[in-house]
């Protein structure tokens, strides 16, 4: 479905399993037609999404899509949680689905869990 509305391509209930101490880039894929919208990231706290004002972000431009990137350098244990990007476009606020980061703290994990273990049992990840 082609349209000139801004669209944010984050899958509903998507998830990423990452290690504390590693760098990580969380991408918000943005499709727009003419003027690039103003995009922000926020972190869910219950039903409220708290805007991430002081975090490093950047844009990556590709042919048919752009990416608004939230940088984690490095990932910290309290980065665990759900994030959402939002775009302001012609006075409208467009919100993405949330995406969840499961952070494994390497100090307390005896070995790096496999991707399948992390994906299938995310409730075990932050321990």
């Amino acid at each position: 479905k082609e349209s000139c509305d801004v669209q944010l391509y984050i899958k509903r209930q998507s998830e990423h399993s990452i290690l504390a101490g590693d760098p990580f880039e969380l991408e918000c894929p943005v499709k727009y037609c003419a003027n690039r919208p103003h995009v922000t990231w926020c972190k869910l706290n219950g039903t409220t999404c708290v805007k991430l004002e002081d975090r490093q972000t950047s844009w990556k431009e590709e042919k048919n899509i752009s990416f608004f990137i939230l940088h984690f350098e490095p990932v910290l244990p309290n980065d665990n949680g759900s994030y959402r990007c939002s775009a302001n476009f012609q006075s409208n606020l467009i919100e993405s689905h949330s995406t969840t980061l499961y952070v494994t703290d390497v100090k307390s994990a005896s070995e790096r869990p496999s991707k399948d273990e992390m994906a299938s049992r995310p409730w075990l990840l932050y321990r």
């Epitope: 479905k1 984050i10 899958k11 509903r12 209930q13 991707k115 399948d116 994906a119 299938s120």
Partner: antibody
Framework: QVQLVQSGAEVKKPGASVKVSCKAS????????MYWVRQAPGQGLEWIGR????????RYAQKFQGRATVTADTSTSTVYLELSSLRSEDTAVYYC????????????WGQGTTVTVSS | DIVMTQSPDSLAVSLGERATINCKSS???????????LNWLQQKPGQSPKRLIY???KLDSGVPDRFSGSGSGTDFTLTISSVQAEDVAVYYC?????????FGQGTKLEIK
């Protein structure tokens, strides 16, 4: 349009494993979630698990955890369900399905694969 | 796990009459985006299931407008305003919010 074609019927002995395939067309499977559901003869629908083909992350119903494995090959747009330690109660039609990961635009089911477990 | 309970288990309706199927979830189906991911499927005899309705009330493309969905919270309804012979099928509600995904037990629609 989006279509799914599943592999053919299988007959297996108890204790064996089965691997069913599901090939998608009309969509980039990285933009979807693909999932497996089964239906025992004369019964309702039972969700087995799903995969995000973009990163390989899986989720399973507790009942199938450790016995079912869902994998995806994005180069061939194919998703697989492997079920091990088969028992007679696993006799069912196994359906793969695909839905749009972003906007709920589509939800399409395969034609089903009959798996019969019998000694 | 979320329990999805449909009623009735079966119903027989005359051609042109209204059919109503209810679905109750054991807890809210609202996702983090505030939307309820409640779908209705139709499974005709010998066929694969097919999605009719998603997000409680949105019709899939190609689905006749005699089908409609409604509800909120934990109570949802599928209505066929004027039943046709080709509507003979089993109808399932299912929730796409919580893991594991779960289905209602199905409601068999027959023509009286």
């Amino acid at each position: 349009q989006v279509q799914l074609v599943q592999s053919g019927a299988e007959v297996k002995k108890p204790g064996a494993s089965v691997k069913v395939s599901c090939k998608a067309s009309g969509v980039n499977i990285k933009d979807t979630y693909m999932y497996w559901v089964r239906q025992a003869p004369g019964q309702g629908l039972e969700w087995i698990g799903r995969i995000d083909p973009a990163n390989g992350y899986t989720r399973y119903a507790q009942k199938f955890q450790g016995r079912a494995t869902v994998t995806a090959d994005t180069s061939t747009s194919t998703v697989y369900l492997e079920l091990s330690s088969l028992r007679s109660e696993d006799t069912a039609v196994y359906y793969c399905a695909v839905n749009d990961g972003y906007f709920e635009y589509f939800d399409v089911w395969g034609q089903g694969t009959t798996v019969t477990v019998s000694s | 796990d979320i329990v999805m309970t449909q009623s009735p288990d079966s119903l027989a309706v005359s051609l042109g009459e209204r059919a109503t199927i209810n679905c109750k979830s054991s807890q809210s189906l609202l996702d983090s985006d505030g939307k309820p991911y409640l779908n209705w499927l139709q499974q005709k005899p010998g066929q694969s299931p097919k999605r009719l309705i998603y997000l409680v009330s949105k019709l899939d493309s190609g689905v006749p407008d005699r089908f409609s969905g409604s509800g909120s919270g934990t109570d949802f309804t599928l209505t066929i305003s004027s039943v046709q012979a080709e509507d003979v099928a089993v109808y399932y509600c299912w929730q796409d919010t919580h893991f594991p995904r779960t289905f209602g037990q199905g409601t068999k629609l027959e023509i009286k």
